[in-house]
């Protein structure tokens, strides 16, 4: 059962001092989603018992395993049902506390009733303030039964529930017809899923015989021990003022557990702490009584004395619950109450015994839950005890349950039951997850959902190249951290699998499903350098670069040119997708801008080192295009061009540039400067006869301007081949300006 206790402080004279505390002894309890388990929850449950709304209650977390509810302002705040929820996953457990008003018309003789399936439950409500009206019994808030007020027996109204079944469990209340719900007597009925002394799915298994008022859990057969007792069968008393499954918790305050109600997981319910009784748990046990609610009687023999917290304290030479066993009778010593092994392991179990006559190897035996008896393979005999060692056959799940070590001598016999939990090693249900990859390493998240049992003690990551027959490489990692697989081959697929382990021998689970993770390309290592660049216009830049010569193939897919405009804080990236390229034309740049330029080699998504940067200043944008460009053939080698000056000039023109190209020709165009900017006409000489030419021109101020329209004209006749065009210009005369 989950180690979860809900404590109610019942000092009811002052509701503001009332508090509820939920304490978990579970590992990692209450730490929230960053640990293995969800947090503890403690709340008032208003679904069944609705009380007038008050100020909100204050919840305070004290460390990782304790939560306290305070802020009750008036007695009516206390009345009703409170619950604490703790434990993780399938072990998530709700502990319930039902609070009755001490001033109610009806009071429960006993709040919690735990009964077996098929039993008759009797709820008894004692008349505290009489009303001459019907008494209504409700179950989980709905009408259940009516009693006439005359039907009280000895000042009590009884509700008999014959042959109860688990669905009958819940909150019951008895209320006078015209009374407020705060005047009700509230009860909690817990119906175990099995008949007395049985547990398991078909109630086929036998309970271990819980002592000191412990209750056998109908699902797992474990004893839920009263506060103040521990052990598989609750056979051991805690020191006064301590509680929890291992007696690890201590009652707060100087008066120990006085005034505290303890609620434990079903089917136990609630009771006073060991040594206390009464509706407010403030009365010490009467002589001869002990335990929770003082329900147990000592009946000590052979001079034993009764301690109200632990029961009989035996004089030397005697032991047993009632000091009824002589120390001559053999006795099992220091047997662990619970052992845990992994499935399919073959553990060794030791069982030590003492007595007179002295136990020998053959007098100690081990009995499994299915009744199989194991004999010890060897025994270690010491002056004060004999320890028998048992080699257990390969464990199966059915071996989970209560085992028994038994010693028999002529002096008598003793046996000790202990719980064996056979755990299933964890097996990942999913493959690990790739977080990031590089050329030589993969970062992997190894923690995945798993079948089987936790906790996870180690995580092993197995990996090897895909389709390889070589041995797997293995790395052991912390369960909560990501793993970096290093020294891998670039651009290689790796098969990666997770293996989980739980504590103990044989705790390694099977490997989980594989997943394919691929490393990145190798990083390009060569650093280019910029050979040069020249401006081909106010918005065009031609760049060239080189790479160092190295043996072997070039590791790279292309080049990335970066232009950084520091003034505007903008970066321009140009991708050159051939690794053989060594030049590129950058267009669409911003005229008059100062750029920082660099180039780097890339491979897949990885960039190599950048070249040393160059600083380039593009000229500002030039003037508008000249207007009305016209061409007129003058001879077989001359063509005259005329134009008009551009409009809206930003400054004086420094020159014109004429572009001459043979129509349909494949060669580069020729640029000819007209250095006298005032002219509006020029003659291009040295042309070939009977050849069609294309002309366009632009002006320059600080930078070159826009091109004019293109015009076509053919030279005349069939003259000799000219050496190449030249130019003569003058201011166009009015007569020539057509």
């Amino acid at each position: 059962a989950v180690d979860l206790t809900l404590l109610a402080n019942l000092r009811l004279t002052d509701p503001q001092r009332f508090f509820l505390t939920c304490v978990s002894g579970e590992a990692g309890a209450g730490r929230g989603s960053d640990a293995w388990g969800p947090p503890l929850l403690l709340e008032k449950d208003d679904r069944i018992v609705r009380t007038p709304p008050g100020p909100p209650l204050r919840l305070a977390r004290n460390g990782s395993h304790q939560v306290t509810l305070r802020g009750f302002s008036k007695p009516s705040d206390l009345v009703g049902v409170f619950s604490c929820v703790g434990g993780a996953g399938a072990r998530r457990t709700r502990v319930i506390y039902v609070h009755n008003s001490p001033g109610a018309h009806l009071l429960p003789d006993k709040v919690t009733h735990t009964v077996n399936k098929g039993d008759t439950a009797v709820l008894s409500a004692r008349v505290h303030k009489e009303k001459q009206t019907d008494v209504i019994w409700k179950s989980n808030g709905s009408y259940f039964y009516t009693l006439d007020w005359h039907e009280a027996q000895d000042g009590r109204f009884l509700l008999q529930l014959p042959n109860v079944q688990p669905p009958s469990s819940g909150i019951y209340s008895a209320t006078y017809l015209e009374a407020s719900p705060l005047g009700s007597a509230f009860f909690r009925l817990i119906v175990r899923g099995c008949g007395a002394g049985r547990w398991g799915p078909g109630c086929t298994k036998e309970c271990p015989g819980c002592l000191h008022g412990g209750v056998c859990h109908d699902h797992d057969g474990e004893c839920v021990c009263p506060p103040g007792f521990t052990g598989t069968r609750c056979e051991q008393a805690c020191r006064e003022g301590r509680f929890g499954q291992s007696c690890q918790e201590q009652c707060p305050g100087i008066s120990g557990c006085r005034g505290l109600t303890f609620c434990l997981p079903d089917p136990y319910g609630c009771s006073c702490g060991s040594g206390w009784r009464g509706s407010q748990c403030q009365e010490a046990c009467a002589p001869g009584h002990f335990g929770a609610d003082c329900r147990l009687q000592c009946q000590c023999q052979n001079g034993g004395t009764c301690d109200r917290f632990s029961g009989c304290v035996c004089p030397s030479g005697w032991h047993g619950v009632h000091c009824e066993k002589s120390d001559r009778i053999p006795q099992i010593l220091n047997m662990a109450s619970e052992l845990e092994f992994n499935l399919e392991t073959m553990p060794r179990i030791n069982c030590a015994a003492a007595g007179n006559p002295f136990p020998v190897r053959g007098s100690i035996e081990l009995r499994k839950p299915d009744g199989t008896v194991l004999l010890s393979t060897k025994a270690i005999v010491e002056p004060e005890k004999t320890t028998a060692e048992f080699e257990v056959p390969r464990l199966v799940l059915a071996d989970s349950g209560f085992w028994e070590c038994r010693v028999s001598t002529s002096g008598g016999q003793d046996s000790r039951r202990f719980k064996v939990n056979v755990k299933v090693p964890p097996v990942p249900l999913a493959a690990p997850r790739l977080l990031t990859k590089q050329s030589r390493q993969l970062v992997v998240s190894p923690l995945v959902s798993f079948s089987g049992d936790g906790p996870i003690s180690t995580v092993r990551l197995h990996y090897r190249p895909q389709d390889s027959t070589m041995d797997w490489s293995t790395i052991v990692v912390d369960p909560s951290e990501n793993v970096t697989l290093m020294n891998l081959r670039p651009k290689t697929g790796y098969s990666v699998r997770v293996q989980l382990s739980r504590p103990g021998e044989g705790g390694e689970g099977a490997w989980g499903p594989p997943t394919l993770m691929t490393t990145d390309c190798p990083e390009p290592l060569l650093q280019p350098w910029l050979e040069g660049w020249h401006v081909e216009g106010t918005d065009r830049l031609r760049v060239s670069w080189s790479l160092p010569l190295v043996p072997g193939p070039l590791v790279g897919d292309g080049f990335l040119l970066r232009l950084w405009d520091g003034t505007r804080g903008q970066e321009r990236r140009e991708n050159v997708s051939s690794p053989q390229a060594r030049t590129a034309l950058l267009t669409g740049l911003t005229p008059g801008t100062h750029y920082q330029l660099d180039v780097q080699l890339y491979h897949c998504t990885l960039l190599g080192p950048a070249s040393p940067p160059a600083h380039v200043l593009l000229p500002p944008s030039g003037p508008p295009a000249p207007r009305h460009l016209h061409a007129q053939a003058l001879s077989d080698s001359e063509i005259q061009l005329t134009w008009k000056h551009p409009e809206a000039l930003p400054g004086p023109i420094s020159k014109y540039v004429v572009e001459v190209q043979v129509a349909g020709g494949a060669g580069d165009p020729l640029w000819i400067d007209v250095d006298r900017p005032e002219e509006t006409s020029t003659i291009i000489r040295g042309l070939n006869a009977s050849t069609r030419y294309l002309f366009r021109m632009r002006a320059s101020i600080q930078g070159l301007g826009d091109w004019s329209n293109t015009v076509e004209e053919s030279t005349l006749g069939n003259g000799l081949q000219a050496e190449g065009p030249v130019q003569e210009s003058r201011a166009a005369e009015e007569g020539l300006d057509q």
Partner: antibody, heavy 124, light 108 residues
């Protein structure tokens, strides 16, 4: 389906006896208070008697006290009304009814299920 | 004993009209134990309202109960043909249980 079915009515002479039965079905009879209500021809409703679930406590209208006895058999889901020393003024249709209590606070009470009635005629 | 008096004895109205029925207790009673029933000729009574104002399952919302102390009212906002019947109020307290004398709602 929740229902109540009365039987046992008929013609009887003054001073005679009759036993009415009411068979319940569709609900847990043993948990509810049950009552008899009658209606003389052309008149209003008159409460006659009531019995608590345990059968241990019973109540009667003054007009029938000492002559009528209400009882129940929870194992048979049946309510009875034993009528002795019958008079002409007992002539009526007799209905059995379930007293229901709504679980909220404050608890509300009413007869939510009625039988179809059985006619009792007392005449010489 | 508590007496329950209903008025008027007969109420003659046309379909679509509003009906207001009154029930007066001889002493103050708890509204949570006041119920109204409808009875048609040859049929058993049928629960309409419990707790003075809560409609029973399946009862149309044209039926409304109200009141406290000694004076209680059943209102039928718009009479439908099937609403013409006798209506009884009833109180549950210490024995005996008491019914009012009834109000007959008939077609005008």
């Amino acid at each position: 389906e929740v229902q109540l079915l009365e039987s046992g009515g008929g013609l009887v002479q003054p001073g005679g006896s009759l036993r009415l039965s009411c068979a319940a079905s569709g609900f847990t009879f043993s948990r509810y208070r049950m009552d008899w209500v009658r209606q003389a021809p052309g008149k209003g409703l008159e409460w006659v008697s009531g019995i608590y679930p345990s059968g241990g406590h019973t109540y009667y209208a003054d007009s029938v006290k000492g002559r009528f006895t209400i009882s129940r058999d929870n194992s048979k889901n049946t309510l009875y009304l034993q009528m002795n020393s019958l008079r002409a003024e007992d002539t009526a249709t007799y209905y059995c009814a379930r007293l229901y209590l709504w679980g909220s606070y404050p608890t509300q009470v009413a007869f939510d299920i009625w039988g179809q009635g059985t006619m009792v005629t007392v005449s010489s | 004993d508590i007496q329950m008096t209903q008025s008027p004895g007969t109420l003659s109205l046309s379909p679509g009209e509003r009906a207001t029925l009154s029930c007066r207790a001889s002493q103050s009673v708890s509204s949570t134990y006041l119920a109204w029933y409808q009875q048609k000729p040859g049929q058993a009574p049928r629960l309409l309202i419990y707790g003075a104002s809560s409609r029973a399952t399946g009862i149309p919302d044209r039926f409304t109960g109200s009141g406290s102390g000694t004076d209680f009212t059943l209102t039928i906002s718009r009479l439908e043909p099937e609403d013409f019947a006798v209506y009884y109020c009833q109180h549950y307290g210490s024995s005996p249980l008491t019914f009012g004398g009834g109000t007959k709602v008939e077609i005008k």
